[in-house]
């Protein structure tokens, strides 16, 4: 009689992560008597996957009734495949004895596992930066297989070219990760801008996966200040306004100084938003000129988003206004935010 052959008809099998893999194996004879075992890998370090005779293998089921005496089909199904299951599986016939001895092995079936990349996560710099500065964004995606993957960066739909990408590990692995760093130059118009990392992989049936970062979380647009003197409201009263324009984020504190002395401090609240996402705000100060013998230096000092204060001054000519006889009251500190 012809000697038993172990036939593994599939040289390779490819399975999606989470699915079941069927590994086919048939023998051509019932002799010699003895069990079949399945291993992953070859040599002394091979891993037992299934033993027909004994053991508990919760993820493995036999395709046919392998316990039947005449059975010659020893195909198995492995459930809930993960990338860690990739490898070459061997169906091995043993000869019954004490102990059983290996008789013949199949040629092996290479199991490759296809796994989708995780949703890309984009992260920006820890601290805010101002326009004209270059900031770095990173994008990461994990757990995909095979290794081939493409990653692109976009800013508001325009593809970026200044980035570096690594896929790890470099050698063979059950699954892979991608890490990319892109450099982006900020502009004053970037409050509404988005940076997008796009990952494409063979397993993705839809469009590429996207991760986004809003530049509103990265940019700081410092304000421009303008102090102007309004026409006299009433006798001896002058209205001075401080226009704080085009700033982002909203966190802003304004202090009025009269000849270097703090007159009033207020926090920006009722701001107007510009189309580009920056804010404008206006504060005004009513000054009673009759309280001053000399010219007054009015300073609008702004502290924006925890940064060092910037200021703008305005010289108020007291001599240009008639003085009230016998009046020595202090400058009036009433003021208000205006839209």
């Amino acid at each position: 009689e012809e000697e038993l052959q172990v036939i593994q008809p599939d040289k390779s099998v490819s399975v999606a992560a989470g699915e079941s893999a069927i590994l086919h194996c048939t023998v051509t004879s019932l002799i010699p008597v003895g069990p079949i075992q399945w291993f992953r890998g070859a040599g002394p370090a091979r891993e037992l996957i299934y033993n027909q005779k004994e053991g508990h293998f919760p993820r493995v089921t036999t395709v046919s009734e392998s316990t039947k005496r005449e059975n010659m089909d020893f195909s198995i199904s492995i459930s809930n495949i993960t990338p860690a299951d990739a490898g070459t599986y061997y169906c091995v016939k043993f000869r019954k004895g004490s102990p059983d001895t290996e008789f013949k092995s199949g040629a092996g079936t290479e199991l490759s596992v296809r796994a989708k990349p995780s949703a890309p996560v984009v992260s920006g710099p820890a601290a805010r930066a101002t326009p004209q500065h270059t900031v770095s964004f990173t994008c990461e995606s994990h757990g995909f297989s095979p290794r081939d993957i493409t990653l692109k960066w976009f800013k508001n739909g325009n593809e970026l070219s200044d980035f570096q990408t690594n896929v790890d590990p470099v050698g063979e692995s059950v699954s892979y990760s991608i890490h990319s760093t892109a450099k982006v130059v900020l502009t004053r118009e970037d409050v509404h801008s988005q940076v997008i990392c796009e990952v494409a992989h063979v397993t993705l049936q839809g469009d590429p996966l996207r991760g986004t970062a809003n530049l509103s979380e990265t940019i700081r647009v410092p304000p421009t200040l303008e102090v102007t003197q309004q026409p006299v409201r009433a006798e001896n009263q002058v209205n001075v306004t401080c226009q704080v324009r085009k700033f982002y984020p909203q966190r802003l504190q304004l202090t009025w100084l009269e000849n270097g002395n703090v007159s009033r401090t207020e926090t920006a609240s009722t701001v107007t938003e510009n189309k580009d996402g920056t804010y404008n705000w206006m504060s005004w100060l009513l000054v009673n000129v009759s309280a001053h013998r000399d010219d007054v230096k009015l300073t609008c000092q702004v502290e924006h988003d925890g940064q060092p204060a910037v200021s703008k001054s305005h010289d108020l000519k007291v001599s240009a206004h008639p003085k009230e006889q016998g009046s020595n009251t202090a400058a009036e500190n009433t003021g208000s935010n205006e839209r």
Epitope: H201, V202, D207
Partner: antibody
Amino acid sequence: QSVEESGGRLGTPGTPLTLTCTVSGFSLSSYVMGWFRQAPGKGLEYIGIISSSGSPYYASWVNGRFTISKTSTTMDLKMNSPTTEDTATYFCARVGPLGVDYFNIWGPGTLVTVSL
Amino acid sequence: DIVMTQTPSSVEAAVGGTVTIKCQAGQSINSYLAWYQQKPGQRPKLLIYYASTLESGVPSRFKGSGSGTDYTLTISDLESADAATYYCQSWHYISRSYAFGGGTEVVVK
């Protein structure tokens, strides 16, 4: 699971023509679908695909000659301005469950003849 | 676009024999290669994908191999039912585009 093309007929140059691919047994919202063609006695030629989310991608030679779109149950190929060179059997196909690198379900094809 | 060069354009072999069809890509396609069988007046039928993975239900007489730019389809123990035209098809993971070889007609004597 199957796909089937329809809409093939005798057309005239310059007159738009729309082919439809109807699927059964699976959802168009889960798979990439493709359009291909085969001129009489010639080989297979890739036209374009539409992703599960509805974004079309075309072969570089298409240059606006075709438009791919889909509804929940059908995928269309519009021949915007056919010429006699577009005479062919048009196939729609679905990519495999493991990835977009191969097509495992093909329709029987529908014949389009563009003639003066 | 990647150009796929398939050879030979036609091959003849006897029942029980072996046929080898080659496909060369203009650049590396990282094993993203599929083989199809098409008989006259019929739709293409997937045989092999990812260079060497046999599609379910396809006899193991069909064997795919290769990597990088060079791929081979081997049909052994030829049967008369194997008479058909065979096409290779690539997918390029960077351009995400597809290309077909010109086809090989297999005639079984």
